[in-house]
């Protein structure tokens, strides 16, 4: 069965021709039988909402490649599936790639989807909070303060995911200065904009400012933690809130390191290591499984600053949600 | 719908010869065609078949020996340097409709006999 | 390389009986197999599709059956016009390749 599945060629992560891996090939899905109930799982799987269509996998650009299997002769799910895994699955007996699957599903929104690569918030705690920085033509620019209002911080937040802009006085400290050059200034944004580039501002590049005004950023940073199902809020099964919705963690990876991050933000003390057993006491989550590869170094004061996969793509079940255990 | 094969004939080893499979009411540019062979009293054998689109797919022993080509009315089966082991009926097939690898509307054939 | 091996070569049965024959593949094809009737002088005709699948216009005394490696196509209530060999086919296409292969046939013979 698939061990992974992603949606390729649309104008968002969360609609495209369907791709699953199998023995780390990947390949397509047939549309033999593929309807909206299949589409509801594939898109709670992704993290993507509700489904809105099963749109032909031809129309999406660049089409499958000559080489590429197509891997699934057809899927049959009752739509209460957590993963296409688990619905009833038909090997490939004859299908072409004029046949493949294809998908939309309703909520492409920014948190759902990898950070986006044209805007960041540099040098602050966590990805929410920092030095604005914006890409073009490959190259990172900061941006001056003049011009700047909370208006064009919203669109910043919006765009990165990150929930509501915080009014804030804060300025770069000078340890947290850029050292690039500064991209633009005079923005000029209705904060109903989809993106910080769609904003006007003045000429690109040409500006006299200096790196003293470079704008930091704040938003609301929805992330938060939890223990649930334990004696005590120091132990229990790991949920983690982003978007204002709480969901599990995936215990691919997860060790000792992680453990002690969780522990520490929640002023618990210091992780007890459980065993295998003891963690799999508190049972299987219900609904979004939020982070899966979660690497930490240890150092970390926050789960949010560990590496890991972009919120909501992970390949795993309830079965796998991780718990810990805190001295308290 | 109809669909038929001709060119066979006498051919001597390492020579040249191009089978033609005329088909009426069948649409090629959506439907996928194959070719077999039988020899004289023995099972059948896939030699290879042509999508819709144009995509040629062939038997691992075929490779290189037979090419599939095809106009809008007719799909060809060129073989180069045949051998008396290529002696047979050569049958060409509609697949089923939607599918490309069983066939529900076949050609009575044409023989060709390679012999010296 | 599949190799598909059909059992018996042949067989015999009266008007009315049961004739059961057998395809072996060499490895696991799931349900990718069809069967196909040949009279002598003719071209193939397609029975069944993915294993168990009639074909339009096929009596239902024809049945597929099986998967995975082992397959059976039986034919109740023989009838002289059932004569024929009988080829076991695999059928797989995935957009990157096309694996088709015959058996080698079975020949009924109707009393």
């Known amino acids: 069965s698939p061990s992974g599945v992603r949606l390729v060629g649309g104008l968002h992560r969360c609609e495209g021709r369907v791709e699953v891996e199998q023995k780390g090939q990947w390949g397509t899905v047939c549309d033999d039988g593929w309807d909206i109930k299949d589409v509801a799982v594939l898109c709670r799987e992704l993290g993507c909402g509700a489904a809105s269509g099963t749109p032909s996998g031809i129309l999406y650009e660049p089409p499958a490649e000559k080489e590429q299997k197509v891997l699934i002769q057809s899927v049959s799910c009752t739509g209460t599936e957590d993963t296409l895994a688990q619905c009833e699955q038909e090997e490939v007996y004859d299908c072409s790639h004029d046949e493949d699957a294809g998908a939309s599903c309703e909520n492409p929104e920014s948190s759902f989807s990898p950070v986006p690569e044209g805007v960041r918030l540099a040098d602050g705690p966590g990805h929410c909070k920092g030095r604005v920085e914006v890409k073009h033509q490959n190259q990172w620019y900061t941006v001056c303060q003049t011009g700047w209002s909370l208006r064009a911080a919203k669109v910043v937040c919006r765009q990165l995911g990150c929930g509501r802009a915080v009014l804030t006085q804060k300025r770069c400290n000078k340890h947290a200065y850029g050292r690039k050059p500064i991209w633009l200034s005079q923005m000029s944004c209705s904060g109903r904009e989809a993106t910080l580039q769609d904003c006007p501002s003045g000429p690109w590049g040409k500006n006299t400012c200096n790196h003293d005004e470079d704008t930091w950023v704040e938003c609301e940073d929805p992330f938060d933690l939890r223990l649930v199902g334990g004696d005590n809020l120091c132990s229990g099964r790991l949920e983690v809130l982003h978007k204002g919705v709480w969901g599990s963690v995936c215990d691919d990876n997860w060790g000792e390191k992680e453990d002690q991050v969780v522990c520490k933000q929640l002023g618990c003390g210091k992780s007890l290591s459980p065993s295998f057993r003891d963690r799999k006491c508190y049972g299987p989550g219900v609904g979004r499984i939020w982070l899966d590869n979660v690497r930490c170094s240890g150092e970390e004061q926050s789960l949010e600053q560990c590496q890991h996969r972009f919120w909501g793509f992970h390949d795993c079940t309830h079965q796998e949600d991780v718990a810990v255990i805190c001295s308290g | 719908q109809s669909v038929e094969e001709s060119g066979g004939r006498l051919v001597m080893p390492g020579g040249s010869l191009t089978l033609t499979c005329t088909v009426s009411g069948i649409d090629l540019s959506s439907n996928t065609m194959g070719w077999f062979r039988q020899a004289p009293g023995k099972g059948l054998e896939w030699i290879g078949i042509m999508r819709g689109g144009g995509s040629t797919y062939y038997a691992t022993w075929a490779k290189g020996r037979f090419t599939i080509s095809k106009t809008s009315t007719t799909v060809d089966l060129k073989l180069t340097s045949p051998t008396t082991e290529d002696t047979a009926t050569y049958f060409c097939?509609?697949?089923?409709?939607?599918?490309?690898?069983?066939?529900?509307?076949w050609g009575q054939g044409t023989l060709v006999t390679i012999s010296s | 390389e599949l190799d598909l091996t059909q059992t018996p070569a042949s067989v015999s049965e009266p008007v009315g009986g049961t004739v059961t024959i057998k395809c072996q593949a060499s490895h696991n094809i799931n349900s990718a197999l069809a069967w196909y009737q040949q009279k002598p002088g003719q071209p193939p005709k397609l029975l069944i599709y993915?294993?168990?699948t009639l074909a339009s216009g096929v009596p239902p005394r024809f049945k597929g059956s099986g998967s995975g490696t082992e397959f059976t196509l039986t034919i109740s209530d023989l009838e002289c016009a059932d004569a024929a060999t009988y080829y076991c086919?695999?059928?797989?296409?995935?957009?990157?390749?096309?694996?088709?292969?015959f058996g080698g046939g079975t020949e009924v013979v109707v009393k």
């Open positions: 097939a509609r697949a089923f409709p939607g599918y490309n690898s069983f066939f529900n509307f």
């Open positions: 086919q695999r059928h797989y296409f995935d957009g990157a390749s096309a694996d088709i292969a």
């Open positions: 993915k294993a168990s």
